[in-house]
Every structure is written in structure tokens, then in C-alpha cells.
Amino acid sequence: SGTTNTVAAYNLTWKSTNFKTILEWEPKPINQVYTVQISTKSGDWKSKCFYTADTECDLTDEIVKDVKQTYLARVFSYPAGHVESTGSTEEPPYENSPEFTPYLETNLGQPTIQSFEQVGTKVNVTVQDEWTLVRRNDTFLSLRDVFGKDLIYTLYYWKSSSSGKKTAKTNTNEFLIDVDKGENYCFSVQAVIPSRRTANRKSTDSPVECMGHEKGESRETGHHHHHH
């Protein structure tokens, strides 16, 4: 199976959020197809996305086997219509990806405020725990399950009537903050892994939720609301 006129892939890039992990590359194929291989440092290469005309490959199923391992992927280029031939010794053109360690490098997805509940001058704000595709004993793990205390949330809150923001931090998914009685507050949260020293240390901010809207109400009004 000759590999003449096939070009090696380039710009191999990992795109990963909450461990959902896709390898992307160029170029868009003209008369060629791609196969991806992925390995940890063991060198046990596993083939994925066989003879695809796409320029991306979902490698989530492989990296979630051990998110603390470091992975390398490589993309092989074959002529379109390629049929695997056992007799061929010619190595197709390929390129290696950068190394990727999911635990250190996956981006933190935008969090969501699940609920808030006011009791007097205290408000309990709960952050929704996102599910990931990481498994343990055939059970999917949440982001908190995977990161444990390495993951914190920062809460930004402010009176609806002013712009001065306050912050609180938690290494659980709950905040208990003091508020002024009779004031409505708005809330936004951000996921943070403080031990990271890179750009992917923080998530984007959650959508803003404000008291007096349906996500949560003061208990004093007689109804408090939880969205799941």
C-alpha cells in the first residue's frame, strides 16, 4: 500500500473540557484518510478513528482509563480507498501530538448554580456537580469525585442594587454566606484548581443568578426552589 501523495497531519491539538477529549488536526483531507493512535508512556499504541476523513478524533474513552497518566497521540495519513495490507512494510506519514495529561490539562467547564436558599441573613448557594465520563467500578464520576479537594469554587456575589462584588471560596460544592436582610443578591461561580499554574487554572464564570428569580427564593416568602 503506497503512501505517495499523502501528507502528514500537522497542528495536532488537544481540546478537552471536563475530560471530554478530542484530538484535532489539519489539513482537511484531499484524497487521503487518517488513523489515530494513542498511548501512555508504556508505548502500547491503540488505534482509533480508523481511516477517517474527519480531522478530529474523540479519544475520551482512552484517556478516562487513567486521567493522571500522560498520553501521546499520533495521526497517520493513508491514500483514500486504502485497504490494510499485511505485506506492506512502508510506514505511512504521521505526526505526533503534544503530550497531554488530562488531570492537569483538561479545561474546567462552565459551572452552573444549582440552587440558592435564604434563611434569615444566611444564603446557601449550591454549585451543580458536573458528571464526567471518568469511571470507577462502572460508575461515572463527578468532577468533584475526580478532583477532590484539588477543585475549589469561587463565588462572586453582589447586591442587585450595587456593583461592589464580594467573594467566597469553598472546597465543597456549597457556600454559606452572610447577606443583608431585605436585600436581593446576584451570584456567579467559577471553578478553580489552585495547584495549576497555567491558563486552564480557572473555568469561565457561571451564568449569573439573582435572588427574586426562579432559581431560589427567600424562605420568608414561603417558597424556595431547587433545580436539578
Epitope: 501512555t40 508512556k41 508504556s42 508505548g43 502500547d44 499504541w45 501521546l72 510506514e91 505526526e95 505526533n96
Partner: antibody, heavy 118, light 106 residues
């Protein structure tokens, strides 16, 4: 501390066989590909063979293909090189090395000397 | 097979000198290149991988650069401990080493 210790070298006649071993410690052995590199007296480095962490993938230099067999026993943290049909040109110091992805060698043993001579 | 050619084969230098060793590949190997240092009677030691990534514990006076077919190892200020033989190694397709460059005292 990561350590690799080769053994099994010695003097052997042309056509003879020898089995080299490499005992690994200080890291999770099965997590890494491993390799053998040799160096003939006064010469440069020559890659010989690589094996993946599971032992499922093996690679050989053309100069040893069909004569040498690389293997590993992950339960014993040991790498092996079975060398058959030895030739004078196989005379060298044989180094065992830890080889992430099977690509480069980040830890080396001290080496064991193989001499093929009649 | 990809051939790796190192130059010079021998280099005479003094302590404090800036030293540059070149390695050329017979075809493009992207950045898949490592550099090793070897002293007489000792095992090689990894200095640089992926053309420019410094291995942990290696002094910062060592640096690597290049991609494609031409690569360099630079020692910014040669120290007494640096007199040794240096090898490049490609890992784009299987593994091949360069012939080595011996750095000796002038």
C-alpha cells in the same frame, strides 16, 4: 530512585546464545516501554530493540531481527534480551533503558559487556 | 531508515566557551529529537528531548533548538564537567543515533 541493572553478559563463541536481564526499580515498570541500546568498543550508540509496557508490541533493528528477542516479566520488574546466532559484530556493551512511548531513553543502566569471539 | 549526521565529530573548547553541536536528519523528523551526554566508561544521560525540552535535573546552560532536519545543542558556558561525547537521536521513525561529537579540552 529509578534504577536499572543489567546482567548476563560474558564471552560467547560465534553462533552461540546469551540472555541478558535488566532488573528495574523505583518506578512502575509496566507503565513504561523499555529498550536495549548497544555500543561496540570505540563506536557510537546503536538502538537494538524496544518493547511496550504490556509486552504486546516489539521493535527490532534490522541488524538483529530474527536473531534477538526482547521480552519482559512485569511481575518481576525485569526486561530480557535473548540473543541467538551471535556474531563478532554483536560484541558491545549492552544498555537497558527506560523509554517513554518507546521514543527516547530517559534512564539508562550501567551496561553489561557481551564479547563474541572464538 | 532515517540517517542522523552530527558535526563536528570532534570539538576542542575551553571552559567558559559557548559550544554548538549540529545534528542533521536525512528527512524531516519534526521536533522528535533527543540529545544525550556520555562520559568514558559510563552510560549515556538524557539532556534534551522533543528538540528543546530540558530533562529534569539538567543544568540550564544546555539548550536545544531546531525542527525539521536541522538541530543544534548549545552549551552556553562550557564547564569542566561538560567534556564528554554528545549524541543526537531521532524518534520519528524507529530510533537512530547520530555518530557522536566529542567535546575535548583545547
Amino acid at each position: 530512585e529509578v534504577q536499572l541493572l543489567e546482567s548476563g553478559g560474558g564471552l560467547v563463541q560465534p553462533g552461540g546464545s546469551l540472555r541478558l536481564s535488566c532488573a528495574a526499580s523505583g518506578f512502575t515498570f509496566s507503565d513504561y516501554a523499555m529498550g536495549w541500546v548497544r555500543q561496540a568498543p570505540g563506536k557510537g550508540l546503536e538502538w537494538v530493540s524496544t518493547i511496550s509496557g504490556s509486552g504486546g508490541l516489539t521493535y527490532y533493528a534490522d541488524s538483529v531481527k530474527g536473531r534477538f528477542t526482547i521480552s519482559r516479566d512485569n511481575s518481576k520488574n525485569t526486561l530480557y534480551l535473548q540473543m541467538n546466532s551471535l556474531r563478532a559484530e554483536d560484541t558491545a556493551v549492552y544498555y537497558c533503558a527506560k523509554a517513554p512511548y518507546g521514543y527516547y531513553m530517559d534512564v539508562w543502566g550501567k551496561g553489561t559487556t557481551v564479547t563474541v569471539s572464538s | 531508515d532515517i540517517q542522523m549526521t552530527q558535526s563536528p565529530s570532534t570539538l576542542s573548547a575551553s571552559v567558559g566557551d559557548r559550544v554548538t553541536i549540529t545534528c542533521r536528519a536525512s528527512q524531516s523528523i519534526s521536533s522528535w529529537l533527543a540529545w544525550y551526554q556520555q562520559k568514558p566508561g559510563k552510560a549515556p544521560k538524557l539532556l534534551i528531548y522533543k528538540a528543546s525540552s530540558l530533562e529534569s535535573g539538567v543544568p540550564s546552560r544546555f539548550s536545544g533548538s531546531g525542527s525539521g532536519t536541522e538541530f543544534t545543542l548549545t552549551i552556553s558556558s562550557l564547564q569542566p564537567d561538560d567534556f564528554a561525547t554528545y549524541y543526537c537521536q531521532q524518534y520519528k521513525s524507529y530510533i537512530t543515533f547520530g555518530g557522536g561529537t566529542k567535546v575535548e579540552i583545547k
